[in-house]
Interface confidence: medium
């Protein structure tokens, strides 16, 4: 029996459902009574879901997995994972045994988009050209860790004096805080771009300093 899975990782958004595709080619006369199907975590070998002895043995993984029972006899051994969590990320092995066996691994990549960044300035009043200011760009509830880029009004990258911290919350999602320290010019626009490397999603925030008042 030959097992086939998609070569590319399956990308799933947090809280949505994902399908880990796996298929095999049943021989003529194949019946489900012959099938042993195991989905397991590749690294730890933890059982996720199984079908054996002619019946679905159910989910062994937080009761969020399901097979496609009507499609099994056609060789569709795909696994549905419901309400995806960050902790679900990783490699899953689809293991099919009829009389001989084969297995293949599929990767699940979890992602969550970052929120539109909020910008804060310190100090935020009595600003003069030549003053040192701290601009903070904050974006929330994304996954995986973000890439953060700063640019000035002319689109020139600002790389010096940038400190970025990323903290995971209890769901494993990241809150990003990036701090830029700059000396003010006469006028200036400072923009921050928070990129989700998996979703290729860019979230933009900017602050323009034109004397007073400030615009965000």
């Amino acid at each position: 029996v030959e097992v086939q899975v998609s070569e590319d990782p399956v990308v799933a958004l947090v809280d949505t459902d994902a399908t880990l595709r796996c298929s095999f080619s049943p021989e003529p006369g194949f019946s489900l009574a012959q099938l042993n199907l195991i989905w397991q975590l590749t690294d730890t070998k933890q059982l996720v879901h199984s079908f054996t002895e002619g019946r679905d043995q159910g989910s062994a993984y937080s009761n969020r997995t399901a097979l496609f029972p009507d499609l099994l006899v056609q060789g569709n051994a795909s696994l549905r994972l419901q309400r995806v969590r960050v902790t679900d990320e990783g490699s899953y092995t689809c293991f099919v045994s009829i009389q001989d066996f084969d297995s293949a691994a599929v990767s699940l990549q979890v992602a969550a988009p970052y929120s539109k960044p909020s910008m804060t300035l310190e100090p935020n009043k009595d600003l003069r050209p030549g003053n040192m200011v701290t601009i903070t760009c904050s974006s929330y509830q994304g996954y995986p860790e973000a890439e953060v880029f700063w640019k000035d009004g002319q689109g020139v990258p600002l790389t010096g004096n940038v400190t970025t911290s990323q903290m995971a919350n209890e769901r494993g999602l990241f809150d990003v805080h990036s701090v830029l320290r700059v000396v003010l010019g006469a006028n200036g626009t400072y923009s921050c771009l928070v990129r989700n490397p998996v979703l290729q999603q860019d979230a933009h925030g900017s602050v323009t300093i034109t004397g007073q008042p400030l615009t965000f």
Partner: antibody, heavy 121, light 107 residues
Framework: QVQLVESGAEVKKPGSSVKVSCKAS????????ISWVRQAPGQGLEWMGR????????NYAQKFQGRVTITADKSTSTAYMELSSLRSEDTAVYYC??????????????WGQGTLITVSS | DIQMTQSPSTLSASVGDRVNITCRAS??????LAWYQQKPGKAPKLLIY???YLQTGVPSRFSGSGAGTEFTLTISSLQPDDFATYYC?????????FGGGTKVEIK
């Protein structure tokens, strides 16, 4: 390379039980099947049953149904075969066997060294 | 259970001989048949699986053929190391069965 190491030879009285262990190393113990095959002196091979450790499910040959129990301890990568109500005809070498990581649950690339169980009063 | 019948039960041959061992199944087993070699005091060794597939590391003088109910193990040129007992095993069903064995001895 999978290695299967069985417990030592035993002499048992008729009517008693015996439990043979088989410790696996060098492969993926939990995912694949461990079978037990016995061979009476000068006789052929006889399949007794198997266990799939990750599922905790055992299948038995009809002949041994009700008299044999196969279990596995995933934490120690050890399979066990317990045979009850022993009689003299159960005197045999008992092998554990495994298809390894790249073959089958139903053919056996790897075998234990065998455990001789002698049933005698 | 599926019954497996091997013939002959004993076979006398000389080094260099071509040897055939037959295995019959009581019902069709497609190609789900394996062959093993066993030497005295040792565990069996897998030679052939799925009727005709040579197990890694097994010399090419061993070959398997057949499908359905009738199968043959052939040793094209018997070597001194090949004197042993050979068993067939079906795995068409969850319940596995072995043939009675064929002892290949020196003529």
């Amino acid at each position: 390379q999978v290695q299967l190491v069985e417990s030592g030879a035993e002499v048992k009285k008729p009517g008693s039980s015996v439990k043979v262990s088989c410790k696996a190393s060098g492969g993926t113990f939990s995912s694949y099947a461990i079978s037990w095959v016995r061979q009476a002196p000068g006789q052929g091979l006889e399949w007794m049953g198997r266990i799939i450790p990750i599922l905790g499910i055992a299948n038995y040959a009809q002949k041994f149904q009700g008299r044999v129990t196969i279990t596995a301890d995933k934490s120690t990568s050890t399979a066990y075969m317990e045979l009850s109500s022993l009689r003299s005809e159960d005197t045999a070498v008992y092998y554990c066997a495994n298809g390894g990581d790249s073959s089958s649950w139903y053919t056996f690339d790897y075998w234990g060294q065998g455990t001789l169980i002698t049933v005698s009063s | 259970d599926i019954q497996m019948t091997q013939s002959p039960s004993t076979l006398s041959a000389s080094v260099g001989d071509r040897v055939n061992i037959t295995c019959r199944a009581s019902q069709t087993i497609n190609s789900w048949l394996a062959w093993y070699q066993q030497k005295p005091g040792k565990a069996p060794k897998l030679l052939i699986y799925k009727a005709s597939y040579l197990q890694t590391g097994v010399p090419s003088r061993f070959s398997g053929s057949g499908a359905g109910t009738e199968f043959t193990l052939t040793i094209s040129s018997l070597q001194p190391d090949d004197f042993a007992t050979y068993y067939c095993q079906q795995y068409n069903s969850y319940s596995l069965t072995f043939g009675g064995g064929t002892k290949v001895e020196i003529k």
